[in-house]
Interface confidence: low
């Protein structure tokens, strides 16, 4: 099974997206796909994907067990992707397990999705 383009498809912040369509003239914010749960092994790399679309382009934040995710150089990072945002955790440790939530806002509305890493 081949992986979606959203894996590692790291983009500039979504605010730079130029959207031009009659379908996008009105403000909207939607979750395109629920976040997947992830099961993986110690020492491996896990990726969680937040697939959202919006106008104006949404700002996406990540939370773990209700606390903001703090990036760790070369180990834990989140980046915009062509379909939203991607959270990547390298060299997994038992302390990395938990509930991960992405929260997207376009300034008016908020949508969120939660996935479990175990």
């Amino acid at each position: 099974q081949e992986t979606e383009l959203s894996v590692s498809a790291e983009l500039v912040p979504t605010s730079s997206w130029n959207i031009s369509s009659e379908l996008n003239k009105d403000s909207y914010l939607t979750l395109d796909e629920p976040m997947n749960n992830i099961t993986t092994s110690l020492g491996q790399t896990a990726e969680l994907h937040c697939k959202v679309s919006g106008n104006p382009p949404p700002t996406i934040r990540w939370f773990k067990n209700d606390a903001p995710v703090v990036q760790e150089p070369r180990r834990l990072s989140f980046r915009s992707t062509i379909y939203g945002s991607r959270l990547r955790i390298r060299n997994l440790d038992t302390t990395d397990t938990g509930y991960f939530q992405c929260v997207a806002t376009n300034g008016k509305e908020v949508v969120s999705s939660t996935g479990v890493l175990f």
Epitope: E4, S16, L23, E33
Partner: antibody
Framework: QVQLVQSGSELKKPGASVKVSCKAS????????MHWVRQAPGQGLEWMGW????????KFNHKFDGRFVFSLDTSVSTAYLQISSLKAEDTAVYYC???????WGQGTLVTVSS | DIQMTQSPSSLSASVGDRVTITCQAS??????LIWYQQKPGKAPKRLIY???SLANGVPSRFSGSGSGTEFTLTISSLQPEDFATYYC?????????FGQGTKLEIK
Amino acid sequence: QVQLVQSGSELKKPGASVKVSCKASGYTLTTNYMHWVRQAPGQGLEWMGWIYPGNGNTKFNHKFDGRFVFSLDTSVSTAYLQISSLKAEDTAVYYCARSDFDYWGQGTLVTVSS
Amino acid sequence: DIQMTQSPSSLSASVGDRVTITCQASQDIGNNLIWYQQKPGKAPKRLIYFATSLANGVPSRFSGSGSGTEFTLTISSLQPEDFATYYCLQYREYPLTFGQGTKLEIK
């Protein structure tokens, strides 16, 4: 097996409109983005944008202005590209391609000529 | 926009030759690159994705390498069916952009 089947060639006059269809089969249309790609005669490939059939949301290349519209009819698993106010420079083959660019339609030649 | 520059724009080679096509990105695109083969009148066929991963059903004589800004498509031993035009595509940043193509012809 996955297939994307596009509508046939079109010959249009400048100022007219055209609607190209892309019928998907062999997979669930609503959970895969659909990209559109343009190739002018003898030229390279240009990404136009995508539509997400799950909700109709779209993202466009800034080079493609409001004359270009992506739409869907999920009841017949079909994506559409509509171009209005056609210009000679719109003459090209238009392709649809699934999320990961792994499957492509056969292409639709749109010729704009007076 | 990210510019993708392919080289050479065309090349002549013989069956059995080893051929290398390069694609240079105007900024870092990580490994977010796809290689395509296109024959006249046909849709592009995906050969390589994530810069180095071989797509399903593609012969192992095709391989991809590189990351960041420099990428290479290698055909280890050219077969008659390999004569075509090859394109790279970056999907790191919107708008997604293709290289201008490399036409591979029979010498």
